[in-house]
Interface confidence: low
Amino acid sequence: SSSPTSSASSFSSSAPFLASAVSAQPPLPDQCPALCECSEAARTVKCVNRNLTEVPTDLPAYVRNLFLTGNQLAVLPAGAFARRPPLAELAALNLSGSRLDEVRAGAFEHLPSLRQLDLSHNPLADLSPFAFSGSNASVSAPSPLVELILNHIVPPEDERQNRSFEGMVVAALLAGRALQGLRRLELASNHFLYLPRDVLAQLPSLRHLDLSNNSLVSLTYVSFRNLTHLESLHLEDNALKVLHNGTLAELQGLPHIRVFLDNNPWVCDCHMADMVTWLKETEVVQGKDRLTCAYPEKMRNRVLLELNSADLDCDPILPPSLQTS
């Protein structure tokens, strides 16, 4: 649903010069932080495109929807939103495009109602494994998060730590089994080359998974079997060449699934036969009539649904002595 719109009548603004005047006093329950717009009726605070370098300390206790987008926060420390009294009603937190490069352990602690978190479009070079779980216990208290939006959080190549970016993100998703209740996970546009095999099995409540616009080449080692609630799986704009029988069977076995496969470089050779047969029969693939071959050259732009077994051949492998250089 769309966020409440800003209007002169419903939002109050705090002038920047008021900030120093109130900083020495405890915040008033309904006061609005400097550089922010607040609507108590909509339970919404917007601190958008203000180049803030830290989370305002004087957020009103009524806040349910908090937009901190387009700022320069850089680091989100432990307890970044911990307040006395706590922000007990904060349910939706949007931190997208705020130049965050480090999210530390426990950054979202003391937010008992936090259901939606959007960290998209931040170059997260250092995402603590305990960013979402808050502790390093093997089993943490369950997080209230239902939606986690992590689109385009990959940092530039020269800012990455000497470790797998996929591994760093997955470690944060799985730590302490805190995200067992997660229903929507978006990981689009992150240059993922692979999906660690254990990640989906440990997120059993997922309804929506968006992996679009990555660089996934294969799903061979990814199991969807446990995701019995999965309703949408977005795999558009990856580097998928073919889906093999095991994956096809698992997807077909999910009762509510809709799969999106557009704009992948499908290789239409003999290995594609099972997938073509499945596509002709299945109803789980949205827009399946748009899927076309990318390779080999002679098959380019052919529609997968229009292929038959005679079209799907593999060139014989020549013995070394007959191969040309």
Partner: nanobody, 120 residues
Amino acid sequence: EVQLVESGGGLVQPGGSLRLSCAASGFTFSSYAMSWVRQAPGKEREWVASITTAGGSTRYADSVKGRFTISRDNAKNTLYLQMNSLRAEDTAVYYCNAELGPRRLGMDYWGQGTLVTVSS
């Protein structure tokens, strides 16, 4: 602007029937699978049924199989849910849903819902 408007709800006795409609506008209705989802008082949203673009395939939650029928008329941009043998546990607000795109917040559209009450 995408709009989904449900109608046809009301009060019905157990064992009775209702037909819900969802009028769609603002997008190419025939290009997208559609679903019905319901939310009973104090409970979470529950998927009820889905139908593919041309209506060639339908799927149902176990709780409504054999009693509910989802259909669509692409010429009229309308989605339907025929509900027979209604039970008290079918009481809920019924929403139609169109997931129109791969991304985002804003690509998953819902109507305002229509209330179905099954009671004697």
